[in-house]
């Protein structure tokens, strides 16, 4: 049985050019994360490994980071940065669990954060 | 030297689920250098990567698939499972399991070339 | 995803005789670590495809030195420098720098 919940960051927005960290958290659960997949729509933008590391998709390697921890940094924002990110935690014994993040790249100086929240 | 050998059926129903598998002799498949993939091809024609499993779990799959596959491995058999979904006529393929080399350096890592394939069971869907 | 075109689409060689083929990508297999990540297979008529070049020209074991490649960024080739009888198939170039992995239409290579 799944029990874990997946806490992101939620709707967030940053302005062009500035720079996001993407992050969720898995709690409620004591399964091992085996890998996180960063996705944008149907994109991969990342993977993290537990044993293997980081795989950046060569597209975003010049605008990912990695981190912090099992999170993801995006670098020089753009309007069409602007959609849904999804963050695909694989865990052993429980299976999947997808926590989604919306980001709003902004041309304006305004960026204020959104609240966090939880997707069961 | 290691194999790998599919199992599963030769006809489908439509609507219904495929599922194979894919048996690994004369090698772990909990070696940390590999990952293990699904690949099809439809008749006469080219290839399609499916998706791809660790052995500790992590998974990719192929987008233009996703919303109907799963993929998952058992390593106390030593070896790795393909379920694809609401399958139709388009879906009859040759389906093959095959082990691709991770390069894996300075904290990043990489997937290089699938080095050893299965011989590849014909899925026809029909009723 | 990356789209790889292969060239020509079928082959007609006198054994003995060189072959060509190429595989272009739709953007740069831009190399990580210093790697590309561009592999190389054939299909034998009725068997599953098997590697004969990885990292764009490294020759798997046991692939005979007839058979080399080379390429970067988004052209690529395999030769053969004498086709034998026994190299006629499908053969195929695949990316994996990024996924989804992905293989080029496949080139027909037959004896005349």
């Known amino acids: 049985m799944m029990t874990g919940t997946i806490e992101t960051t939620g709707n967030i927005s940053a302005e062009k050019g500035g720079s996001i960290i993407l992050q969720c958290h898995l709690s409620s659960t004591t399964a091992q994360v085996t890998q996180v997949n960063w996705e944008q729509q149907d994109q991969l933008l990342a993977i993290c490994n537990a044993d293997l590391g980081w795989h950046i998709s060569p597209s975003f390697k010049d605008r990912v980071a990695p981190g912090p921890g099992l999170g993801l940094t995006l670098q020089s924002l753009t309007v069409n940065d602007t959609g849904e990110y999804f963050c695909i935690y694989h865990t052993y014994p429980d299976g999947t669990y997808t926590g989604r993040i919306f980001l709003e790249v902004l041309e304006s100086s305004v960026a204020e954060h959104g609240a966090r929240f939880q997707i069961p | 030297q290691v194999q790998l050998q599919e199992s599963g059926p030769g006809l489908v129903n439509p609507s219904q689920t495929l599922s194979l598998t894919c048996i690994v002799s004369g090698g772990s498949i909990r070696s940390g250098d590999y990952y293990w993939s699904w690949i099809r091809q439809h008749p006469g024609k080219g290839l399609e990567w499916i998706g791809y499993i660790y052995y500790s779990g992590g998974t990719y799959y192929n987008p233009s698939l996703k919303s109907r596959v799963t993929i998952s491995v058992d390593t106390t058999k030593n070896q790795f499972s393909l379920k694809l979904s609401s399958m139709t006529a388009a879906d009859t393929a040759v389906y093959y399991c095959?082990?691709?080399?991770?390069?894996?350096?300075?904290?990043?890592?990489?997937?290089?070339?699938?080095?050893?394939w299965g011989q590849g069971p014909t899925v026809t869907v029909s009723s | 995803e990356i789209v790889l075109t292969q060239t020509p689409l079928s082959l007609s060689v006198t054994p003995g005789q060189p072959a060509s083929i190429s595989c272009k990508s739709s953007q740069s297999l831009l190399p990580s670590e210093g790697k590309t990540y561009l592999s190389w297979y054939l299909q034998k008529p009725g068997l599953p495809p098997q590697v004969l070049i990885y990292?764009?020209?490294n020759r798997f074991s046991g692939v005979p030195d007839r058979f080399s490649g080379s390429g970067s960024g988004t052209d690529f080739t395999l030769k053969i420098s004498r086709v034998e009888a026994e190299d006629v198939g499908v053969y195929y170039c695949m990316q994996s720098i990024q996924l989804p992995l992905t293989f080029g239409g496949g080139t027909k290579v037959e004896i005349k």
């Open positions: 095959a082990r691709g080399s991770i390069a894996a350096r300075s904290g990043y890592f990489y997937f290089s070339g699938l080095d050893v």
């Open positions: 990292e764009v020209s």
